[in-house]
């Protein structure tokens, strides 16, 4: 189902962008990118 | 003192479940990422996952559906559920902040 | 995956020693960690970002390299960096991959 793929796709991006602030704070220490609370 | 303390190990039948508690002191964590990182006996470090400022957690895939990370920030504690235990989850389970300050580690023992 | 080299070293103090750490792919950002680890304890952070160093961590020690290949090197070792040593890549699909570790025992 097409909606089915769209939201995997987009689960997929966000857990890759949230991953690329992670390894950035962690093994980059780069504080400024940390995510706030929501 | 700043530290992290992890709790809830001990032995588990397999298929059980254990949760285990990471609580903070000397330091609010409200603003880290949290990670949890576990070892077998005799072996190397295995990540299993992180929980951010917002409470969206993410994980390693092997993983992801057993293992659940949550956080209680009024309570500064971070916390790693885990379901349907295997033998090959015998380790010592860390948590830490960022990855620069680390608990002492629990030890989770699934044997019957 | 990251696969470290050797997988034991022994050395006496004074003695220089450099760790390998190769990456199937490239690791993402540079974000390469390195980790010492004694037993029963946890591990403790030495550098970040593939070659610098953690607050407090002395100063022989020192990391290299980029892409796929990463080196650790202490310069001269002391009795207290007997230790198993771990690097740590960034992974944006699995987020961090540890390698095997490096056991550094004394000769």
């Known amino acids: 189902h097409s909606d089915g793929i769209f939201t995997d796709s987009y689960s997929r991006y966000r857990k890759q962008m949230a991953v690329k602030k992670y390894l950035a704070a962690v093994l980059g220490k780069r504080y400024k990118q940390r995510v706030k609370n929501k | 003192e700043v530290q992290l303390v992890e709790s809830g190990g001990g032995l588990v039948q397999p298929g059980g479940s254990l949760r285990l508690s990471c609580a903070a002191s000397?330091?609010?964590?409200?603003?880290?990422?949290m990670t949890w990182v576990r070892q077998a006996p005799g072996k190397g470090l295995e990540w299993i996952g992180f929980i951010d400022a917002g409470g969206d957690a993410y994980y390693a895939s092997w993983a992801k559906g057993r293992f659940t990370i949550s956080r209680d920030n009024s309570k500064n504690t971070v916390y790693l559920q885990m379901n349907s235990l295997r033998a090959e989850d015998t380790a010592v389970y860390f948590c830490a902040r960022d990855l620069d300050l680390w608990g002492q580690g629990t030890l989770v023992t699934v044997s019957s | 995956q990251l696969t470290q080299s050797p997988s034991t070293l022994s050395a006496s103090v004074g003695d220089r020693v450099t760790i390998t750490c190769q990456s199937s792919?490239?690791?993402?950002?540079?974000?390469l960690a390195w980790f010492q680890q004694k037993p029963g304890k946890a591990p403790k952070f030495l550098i970040y970002e593939a070659s610098k160093l953690e607050s407090g961590v002395p100063s022989r020690f020192s990391g290299s390299g980029s892409g796929t290949e990463f080196t650790l090197t202490i310069s001269s070792l002391q009795p207290d960096d007997f230790a198993t040593y771990y690097c740590?890549?960034?992974?944006?699909?699995?987020?961090?991959?540890f390698g095997g570790g490096t056991k550094v025992e004394i000769k």
């Open positions: 740590a890549g960034g992974d944006i699909s699995e987020g961090v991959a």
């Open positions: 792919e490239s690791v993402y950002g540079n974000y």
């Open positions: 000397g330091i609010d964590l409200n603003s880290y990422y």
